[in-house]
């Protein structure tokens, strides 16, 4: 024998205690699939959520962050707070990276700079809070006589044909 | 930490009302389902109802006697209760919930219950 509730589209329960007919979900519920004996209540995107999609008979809400601050979490679970690049979020706020550290997003934590000379390099530009060194040639590279940089060609006078 | 505490409970005559009541602590109901349970001594746990966002859904049993309502400045919701019987004799549980009704959920909090008596 079918259960009756199988004939029960999204957007509605099966009433158990009337005769098993569909019902529809009440407002901010939702079903998302056919057959169920009950509705799931609609999340609700409030205080530092904002609701990106609104909640439908067949589908939940979805949520994400205000201004400033940025999701977390599977399905937006949580909202953290924004800080500027060049900081991390702390117990007590954002603060600076430390010497030697750096963020370049407004989220997450800071981060050592690149250790240039651990793979044989020198560094080209020094790292900031924002940003990371850059890395360059290996210092053997840049001794006189070393160079593997094919040096530009001379630059030819208008008017004269090659030799 | 939720916490539901019901109230209203008491001896009552035959043919009489209670209203009872289920207050809300570490938490507003505005995201739950609100449902009434009862257990008569020595018997299996029955679903009175379900109140969520302006509806409620009730057990078969109860032949529109019982009314819930909510009162979301109070963030407390009532079970009204008319035309008593001997046999609405029961302690009768608030538990809240992320599914309507609550007819075959378990719910994600339950209050410690309240007793109502109905003889004469």
């Known amino acids: 024998l079918q259960d009756p509730c199988s004939n029960c589209p999204a957007g509605t329960f099966c009433d158990n205690n009337r005769n098993q007919i569909c019902s529809p979900c009440p407002p901010n519920s939702f079903s998302s699939a056919g057959g169920q004996r009950t509705c799931d209540i609609c999340r609700q995107c409030k205080g530092v959520f904002r609701t990106r999609k609104e909640c439908s008979s067949t589908s939940n809400a979805e949520c994400d962050c205000t201004p400033g601050f940025h999701c977390l979490g599977a399905g937006c679970s949580m909202c953290e707070q924004d800080c500027k690049q060049g900081q991390e979020l702390t117990k007590k706020g954002c603060k600076d990276c430390c010497f030697g550290t750096f963020n370049d997003q407004k989220r997450g934590i800071c981060r050592p700079w690149t250790n240039c000379s651990l793979d044989g390099k020198s560094v080209l530009v020094n790292g900031t809070k924002e940003r990371d060194v850059v890395c360059g040639p290996s210092p053997a590279d840049l001794s006189p006589g070393a160079s593997s940089v094919t040096p530009p060609a001379p630059a030819r006078e208008p008017g004269h044909s090659p030799q | 930490e939720v916490q539901l505490l019901e109230s209203g409970g008491g001896l009552v005559q035959p043919g009489g009302s209670l209203r009872l009541s289920c207050a809300a602590s570490?938490?507003?109901?505005?995201?739950?389902?609100v449902g009434w349970f009862r257990q008569a001594p020595g018997k299996e746990r029955e679903y009175v109802g379900t109140y969520w966002s302006g509806y409620a859904h009730y057990g078969d049993f109860e032949n529109n006697r019982f009314t819930i309502s909510r009162d979301n400045s109070k963030n407390t919701v009532y079970l009204q209760m008319n035309s008593l019987r001997a046999e609405d004799t029961a302690v009768y549980y608030c538990a809240i919930s992320l599914k309507y009704p609550m007819a075959t959920v378990t719910p994600d909090y339950q209050g410690q219950g309240t007793l109502v008596t109905v003889s004469s």
């Open positions: 570490g938490r507003t109901f505005d995201n739950y389902a």
